[in-house]
């Protein structure tokens, strides 16, 4: 006869491990007992369980409540046992010793591998600002057994670096994603992907990038110079910019206070029916927590009675 077992049994933390040991005997052979022991190198054998043809299952005190026989029907030549709720400390070498009649004793070893799936965590780096050099966008850490694989999935251009820390029964892997921040990255997803044999599918953690920036400011509304004449209604100037975080707008007049009747509505400056009093230099001030920008325009309200055309100068300053 001969023993049938597995070289390696792999189980995920918390699952039940079936330790197989089947005696394929000749006709008339009987199994008297199957003794299971843990036999890690450098340590003495630690008895696990005894399956006896007459006495039944004995579980050693160290494994009380954790070792069972597989559910019926059972073959009397099957010495397999179930190790309930596998923990990392169960990982190691096991031996089944089968005493048969009349063939004598047989033994076989297997290795129990307990996979510890990782619980990854993603930590964003410092605030990203346009104009910075190579900056840490995020780091992703996952610890498991065996060591997990940590990669990144993103459309954003960047560089990665990984490091690994080995513990007694596991390994922690940390991967960092570095980039040169630009406004085009704002709102883009950066996804940490963790792969591990104990996971049915990759674990993914997504971080949305936030890059602080402030675009140059410009003023719209003076494109058609002929519209800026005395008596015109609905004239307005609009300040154009964009930023992260969204900027706030402030209007001032460089050569004096804003004329009465001029309404400030965020990025828009609304005028009452135009008079020559509305001529002047207007400044749009755009700011957010990252930066500030200015854009100024000169408004020259045209008197239709005069022959001279309206002159408009646009000046932008930062």
């Amino acid at each position: 006869g001969e023993l049938e077992t597995s070289d390696v049994v792999t189980v995920v933390l918390g699952q039940d491990a079936k330790l197989p040991c089947f005696y394929r005997g000749d006709s008339g052979e009987q199994v008297g007992q199957v003794a299971w022991a843990r036999v890690d190198a450098g340590e003495g054998a630690q008895e696990l369980a005894l399956l006896h043809s007459k006495y039944g299952l004995h579980v050693s005190p160290a494994y009380e409540g954790r070792v069972e026989q597989p559910p019926p029907p059972r073959n009397p030549l099957d010495g397999s046992v179930l190790l309930r709720n596998a923990v990392q400390a169960d990982e190691g070498e096991y031996e089944c010793r089968v005493s048969t009649f009349p063939a004598g004793s047989f033994q076989a070893r297997l290795r129990l591998r307990v996979l510890v799936p990782p619980l990854p965590s993603l930590n964003p780096g410092p605030a990203l600002e346009e104009g910075q050099g190579l900056t840490l966008a995020a780091s992703c850490t996952a610890e498991g057994s065996p060591a997990p694989s940590v990669t990144w999935d993103t459309e954003v251009k960047g560089t990665t670096s990984s490091r690994s820390f080995k513990h007694s029964r596991s390994a922690a892997v940390t991967s960092e994603f570095h980039l040169v921040p630009s406004r085009s990255m704002n709102g883009q997803p950066l996804t940490c992907v963790v792969s591990h044999p104990g996971l049915l599918q990759d674990q993914r953690i997504t971080h949305i990038l936030h890059v602080s920036f402030l675009a140059e400011a410009s003023v719209r509304g003076l494109e058609d110079q002929n519209l800026w004449h005395i008596g015109r209604e609905g004239a307005m100037l609009k300040c154009l910019s964009e930023g992260q975080p969204p900027p706030s707008y402030n209007w001032t007049r460089l050569d004096g206070p804003l004329p009465s009747g001029v309404r400030v509505d965020g990025d828009t400056l609304g005028f009452p029916p135009l008079t020559t009093e509305h001529s002047g230099i207007y400044v749009c001030h755009v700011s957010n927590e990252f930066s500030s920008r200015d854009s100024q325009v000169t408004v020259d309200v045209l008197d239709p009675q005069e022959d001279s055309g309206k002159q408009v100068d646009l000046v932008s300053a930062s």
Partner: antibody
Amino acid sequence: EVQLVESGGGLVQPGGSLRLSCAASGYSFSDYWMSWVRQAPGKGLEWVSSIKQTGGVKHYADSVKGRFTISRDNSKNTLYLQMNSLRAEDTAVYYCAREYSDVVDYVSVRTPLDYWGQGTLVTVSS
Amino acid sequence: DIQMTQSPSSLSASVGDRVTITCRASQGISSYLAWYQQKPGKAPKLLIYAASSLQSGVPSRFSGSGSGTDFTLTISSLQPEDFATYYCQQHYTTPPTFGQGTKVEIK
């Protein structure tokens, strides 16, 4: 025919010592675990100690641990129980017994006692 | 330690009677249970091992049953030589422990 014969019992004062012997014959002594079991007068049976075939594994009842020592000499087919620091509550008939050999090389369980000696009386009294 | 509780502690019966003695373990012991017979002034004698296996040379009127925690010794037809004290013993763990005994007396 399997035979187990105990000797060495007697009267001893509290704190004293005795060495019991058990001579085995009629079987291959070195193939079996052996045990000592005692029975106080008018009381039930109490397991005392067991020893593996080679003498490499020994088990003791908590009540005698540190005071009694089990040993064997396979060349003489003899089992021993060295009893020190004897107390009045150790007074009993001491039996040596052979363990049934149907569990192979597994120390966590004991097996039934299929052959017993006639017993030797140990009396601890001042 | 595993406690073994026998009942009854004593019983009176007549020759030919069917006698049943029970033994309960404080925790599961599979079939790691033996029954012994002891007559006054004599050493115990193994009757049943593995809860239900008859030891060689023991009359077939003796039988055992049970597994786990509850066990029974039955004498199908009591004979004069059966009047004695009976002990159960678990050998699932060290220390092996005995029941307190059941004395079978003549009615």
